[in-house]
Interface confidence: low
């Protein structure tokens, strides 16, 4: 096995770039929400911590072994072209665990994207026009999903017939942003590790 070189793998580098952008965008959005929603409990101490991906994806479980196992040969290596053909891992031999980890990240992003888009549709109806989701953050989620490019059906945006409760929507926005920031940190750590290994 050759010694690692400093230049990043061109296959993985786009994902590292996007994950860094994602972390920056969600952190900025969370800061904006905290400032704008001053009278809403929006700090990590005040909110209820809720993980919308709980029991639906297994990002932490799937991605943790990648960090624990520095030697990739310890992982169950095999060709996994059936899982991804995106620019992040374009035509490279990847471990089964790595592919599982990245597909789980993709599913996380997809779930948050649906939630955020649904929430933004409600916030746009608010006569106060107090806060909206940063289009840059939504674009960055989209870019990372495209870079991962898993063969996955698109999830339709949830439509809500009842009149939105704007107070609860803004609270839910804070809860989602806090949870998504934690997930973005995990994603960034995974991409940094994969880029360095």
């Amino acid at each position: 096995r050759n010694l690692p070189v400093a230049t990043p793998d061109p296959g993985m580098f786009p994902c590292l770039h996007h994950s860094q952008n994602l972390l920056r965008a969600v952190s900025n959005m969370l800061q904006k929400a905290r400032q704008t929603l001053e009278f809403y409990p929006c700090t990590s101490e005040e909110i209820d911590h809720e993980d919308i991906t709980k029991d639906k994806t297994s990002t932490v479980e799937a991605c943790l072994p990648l960090e624990l196992t520095k030697n990739e040969s310890c992982l169950n290596s095999r060709e996994t072209s059936f899982i991804t053909n995106g620019s992040c891992l374009a035509s490279r031999k990847t471990s089964f665990m790595m592919a599982l980890c990245l597909s789980s990240i993709y599913e996380d992003l997809k779930m948050y994207q649906v939630e955020f888009k649904t929430m933004n549709a409600k916030l746009l109806m608010d006569p106060k026009r107090q806060i909206f989701l940063d289009q840059n953050m939504l674009a960055v989620i989209d870019e990372l999903m495209q870079a991962l490019n898993f063969n996955s059906e698109t999830v339709p945006q949830k439509s809500s017939l009842e009149e939105p409760d704007f107070y609860k929507t803004k609270i839910k926005l804070c809860i989602l942003l806090h949870a998504f920031r934690i997930r973005a940190v995990t994603i960034d750590r995974v991409m940094s590790y994969l880029n360095a290994s």
Partner: nanobody
């Protein structure tokens, strides 16, 4: 165990006033944000007002200028002074420790009618 007990509400004429109080126990009241939420017949739970630790307050647009939320940390008591009451203020009012009203008292009925 968190306990929130609201005072009795009542029947008030339009334009009238009413003061609700809420006795809190089982948690550190002085370091908690507190809320009043309400539920009108056939409607969902609606946020009314928030009071932060230290006393600064925020109100829903529909009660702004008419309702005042206050607290007495020494007595572990939350208050809601309701003035210029309207028929549409008729609802079950709850004192709550969380914004969504999950940690709330039994509620007290306020009816505004002539």
């Amino acid at each position: 165990e968190v306990q929130l007990v609201e005072s009795r509400g009542g029947l008030v004429q339009p334009g009238g006033s009413l003061r609700l109080s809420c006795a809190a126990s089982g948690f550190t009241f002085s370091s908690s944000w507190m809320y009043w939420v309400r539920q009108a017949p056939g409607k969902g739970l609606e946020w009314v007002a928030t009071i932060k630790t230290g006393g600064s307050a925020a109100y829903a647009d529909f009660v702004k200028g008419r309702f005042t939320i206050s607290r007495d940390d020494a007595k572990n008591t939350l208050y809601l002074q309701m003035n210029s009451l309207k028929p549409e203020d008729t609802a079950q009012y709850y004192c709550a420790r969380d914004y969504a009203g999950r940690l709330r008292g039994q509620g007290t009925q306020v009816t505004v009618s002539s």
